[in-house]
Interface confidence: medium
C-alpha cells in the first residue's frame, strides 16, 4: 500500500500559491501570452517549454528518443512522453508532437550504414574502408576511393571527409590528390612552379635548417627552467598554495576512509547511531510526526529552524510494515567523519567554514520553487540535479546542499561564491533573496551554527 504524505504536499502547494501571490517572478512561467513560440519558450528555464494551452505553466521537455503526447497537467508534474516508433527518432530534448523520420543510406552514392536508426539518434551513414566522403551539398555526400599516392608519399592519411594528402616525388606534381608526371604540365599552369628544374626549385637558406632545430629546443629549455623555478618556490613557500604544494612537493596527505573529495553530505545520510557522533542536543523539533506508527505523513516544512533530526535508528526498532521514514533522520547533520574527509583530503576546493556558511545561507535564501531553475543557471545539468535530488530523496535541504557543493567543487577557486550566486540571482530577478543571504551572513542566528557540519 502506498503511504501518503498529504500534509507535506498540501503545505508545498500552499507555499507555492503564496509565492505566486507575493512574488509573481517567484514562479517559473507566469508570463503573458506571446505569439512567437520561440520567444515564449525563452521565458521558461532550460529544458522546459511553455504549455500549449496555458502559458503560465512551464513543462519539462521530453527526453531524446521520445515525443510529446500531452503537456504536463500542472507545474511539478511530468510531461507525458512516448518512445518513438521504429523508423523514427528525436535526437535531443523536445516537445515535438511526432518523431522525425530516419534517413536511409544511399547505395547509389556507395554509402554504407555505420549505425542503424535508434529512437534517440538518426541513422549514421558512412563509407567503406579506404574511402572518404566527398560532399556534393551540405547534407549529401558520395563515397570516393582514397588516393594511394602512387609516385609520392602519404603526408596525411585519408580521413572520413578528406582524401589522402600526398607529397609527390621529383618530376611529379599534385593534381586532385594524384601525383601526375611533369610531362602533363602545360605552360602558364600552377604546376610550372613545382616542375621547375631542381636547382631553381630547391634553393634554401642554409641557416633555416639550423633555426628549425634550435628554436624549439630553446623554447623547451626555457619552459623547463620556468617550471623548475616555479616548483622550487612552491616548495620553499608552501603557504602560497597548500593544495599545489601538497601535489607537487609530495608532502604526505592523509586520506581517511573513503576517496578524497567525496561530497560532504553523507550519501544519503543514514540515521546516526550513538557512536557516530550524533549530538542529541543539536536536534531540532520534529513537526509533522504524530504517534500512529503505520502511515505517518511526512511534512517537509521550510525555514531554517525547521530542519530536524529523528532519534538514532538503533534506539527505535520499526514495526513490520511501518513507514521507514519514521525511523530515519529526515535531515541529519553530516557526521563529523564526513567533514574530516574534506579536511584531510588534498581536494583543491574543499569548502572552509566561511564557504560552508555561504552555501547554507544560499540553500536557505533561494525559494524552493525556484531552486532547480537556480541550479540550472549555476550550470548543473538536468541529469545531475535529478540524481542528487533522488539520492537525497528524504531531505530537500540536503539535496540542495549537495547540488551547491557539486557546483562548488568544479568551480575555479578564485571565483567568489557569493559573486556568482549574486549574478545568477539577479538574472533570475531574485535580488531580494541575495539581500536576505547577505543579511544572514552578516548576522548569523545563534542556531545557525548547529546547522553547519563540524
Amino acid at each position: 500500500m502506498g503511504l501518503p504524505t498529504v500534509p507535506g504536499l498540501l503545505l508545498s502547494l500552499v507555499l507555492l500559491a503564496l509565492l505566486m501571490g507575493i512574488h509573481p517572478s517567484g514562479v517559473t512561467g507566469l508570463v503573458p501570452s506571446l505569439g512567437d513560440r520561440e520567444k515564449r519558450d525563452s521565458l521558461c528555464p532550460q529544458g522546459k517549454y511553455v504549455h500549449s494551452k496555458n502559458n503560465s505553466i512551464c513543462c519539462t521537455k521530453c527526453h531524446k528518443g521520445t515525443y510529446l503526447v500531452s503537456d504536463c497537467p500542472s507545474p511539478g508534474r511530468d510531461t507525458v512522453c512516448r518512445e518513438c516508433e521504429k523508423g523514427t527518432f528525436t535526437a535531443s530534448q523536445n516537445y515535438l508532437r511526432q518523431c522525425l523520420s530516419c534517413k536511409t543510406c544511399r547505395k547509389e552514392m556507395s554509402q554504407v550504414e555505420i549505425s542503424p536508426c535508434q529512437a534517440d539518434k538518426d541513422t549514421v551513414c558512412g563509407c567503406k574502408e579506404n574511402q572518404f566522403q566527398r560532399y556534393l551539398s551540405e547534407t549529401h555526400f558520395q563515397c570516393v576511393d582514397c588516393s594511394p599516392c602512387f609516385n609520392g608519399t602519404v603526408t596525411i592519411p585519408c580521413k572520413e571527409t578528406q582524401n589522402t594528402v600526398c607529397n609527390c616525388h621529383a618530376g611529379f606534381f599534385l593534381r586532385e590528390s594524384e601525383c601526375v608526371p611533369c610531362s602533363h604540365c602545360k605552360k602558364n599552369e600552377e604546376c610550372m612552379k613545382l616542375c621547375l628544374p631542381p636547382p631553381l626549385a630547391n634553393v634554401t637558406n642554409p641557416q633555416d635548417s639550423g633555426t628549425a632545430v634550435l628554436l624549439p629546443l630553446v623554447i623547451l629549455l626555457g619552459l623547463c627552467l620556468l617550471s623548475f623555478i616555479f616548483i622550487s618556490l612552491m616548495c620553499r613557500y608552501p603557504r602560497w598554495r597548500p593544495e599545489v604544494y601538497s601535489i607537487i612537493c609530495r608532502d604526505p596527505v592523509p586520506v581517511k576512509e573513503e576517496k578524497a573529495g567525496k561530497p560532504l553530505t553523507p550519501a544519503p545520510s543514514p540515521a546516526f547511531s550513538p557512536t557516530s557522533g550524533f549530538n542529541p542536543t543539536l536536534g531540532f523539533s520534529t513537526p509533522g510526526f504524530s504517534s500512529p506508527v503505520s502511515s505517518t505523513p511526512i511534512s517537509p516544512i521550510f525555514g531554517p529552524s525547521n530542519w530536524h533530526f529523528m532519534p538514532p535508528v538503533s534506539e527505535v526498532v520499526p514495526t513490520q510494515g511501518a513507514d521507514p521514514l519514521l525511523y530515519e533522520s529526515l535531515c541529519s547533520v553530516p557526521a563529523p567523519t564526513s567533514v574530516q574527509k574534506w579536511e584531510d583530503s588534498a581536494h583543491p576546493q574543499r569548502p572552509d567554514n566561511a564557504d560552508l556558511a555561504i552555501l547554507y545561507a544560499v540553500v536557505d535564501g533561494v525559494p524552493p520553487a525556484r531552486w532547480k531553475e537556480f541550479m540550472r543557471f549555476m550550470g548543473l545539468s538536468e541529469h545531475e540535479i535529478e540524481r542528487l535530488e533522488m539520492q537525497n530523496g528524504r531531505c530537500l535541504r540536503e539535496a540542495q546542499y549537495s547540488m551547491l557543493e557539486a557546483w562548488r567543487r568544479r568551480t575555479p577557486r578564485h571565483e567568489d561564491t557569493l559573486e556568482v550566486v549574486g549574478l545568477v540571482l539577479s538574472k533570475m530577478n531574485l535580488a531580494g533573496c541575495l539581500e536576505n543571504i547577505l543579511e544572514a551572513l552578516r548576522n548569523p542566528a545563534p542556531s545557525s551554527t548547529t546547522r553547519l557540519p563540524r
Partner: nanobody, 120 residues
C-alpha cells in the same frame, strides 16, 4: 488510492541474482519518476536507484552501480530492479517510491517493502 506493492525479495547466496517488482496502481504510472530505496537492519534509508517517467534516464547510487539495473514497463504499471552479484551488505528491506507531484519533496508514496537477505 495510490498503491505500491513490492515483490521478488527472498534469501539468496552472495554472488546470486534477484529481480524485484513493484506493481503500481491508483495514479498515472507513466507520468512519474520512480525510485528504489532500501533500509538495512538497524540502519537508515539509502536511495538505491531511480528512473524517469519514460524509462530513458536511469540513476544509481555508487554502491550498486554496475550491479543493479532499474527498468519499468509503463504498459504494465510495473517498476523493476534487477540485482546481480549480490553482496551481504545488500541485505535490506527494499521499497519502491513514487515521485511527488508537488514541490519540493521528492517522494510522496512508498510501498510496504520486500525483504532481500544475502547470506551463505
Amino acid at each position: 488510492e495510490v498503491q505500491l506493492l513490492e515483490s521478488g525479495g527472498g534469501l539468496v547466496q552472495p554472488g546470486g541474482s534477484l529481480r524485484l517488482s513493484c506493481a503500481a496502481s491508483g495514479f498515472t504510472f507513466g507520468s512519474y519518476s520512480m525510485s528504489w530505496v532500501r533500509q538495512a537492519p538497524g540502519k537508515g534509508l539509502e536511495w538505491v536507484s531511480g528512473i524517469d517517467n519514460g524509462g530513458h534516464s536511469t540513476y544509481y547510487a555508487d554502491s550498486v552501480k554496475g550491479r543493479f539495473t532499474i527498468s519499468r514497463d509503463n504498459s504494465k504499471n510495473t517498476l523493476y530492479l534487477q540485482m546481480n552479484s549480490l553482496r551481504a551488505e545488500d541485505t535490506a528491506v527494499y521499497y519502491c517510491a513514487k515521485r511527488s507531484s508537488g514541490l519540493p519533496f521528492p517522494f510522496d508514496y512508498w510501498g510496504q517493502g520486500t525483504l532481500v537477505t544475502v547470506s551463505s
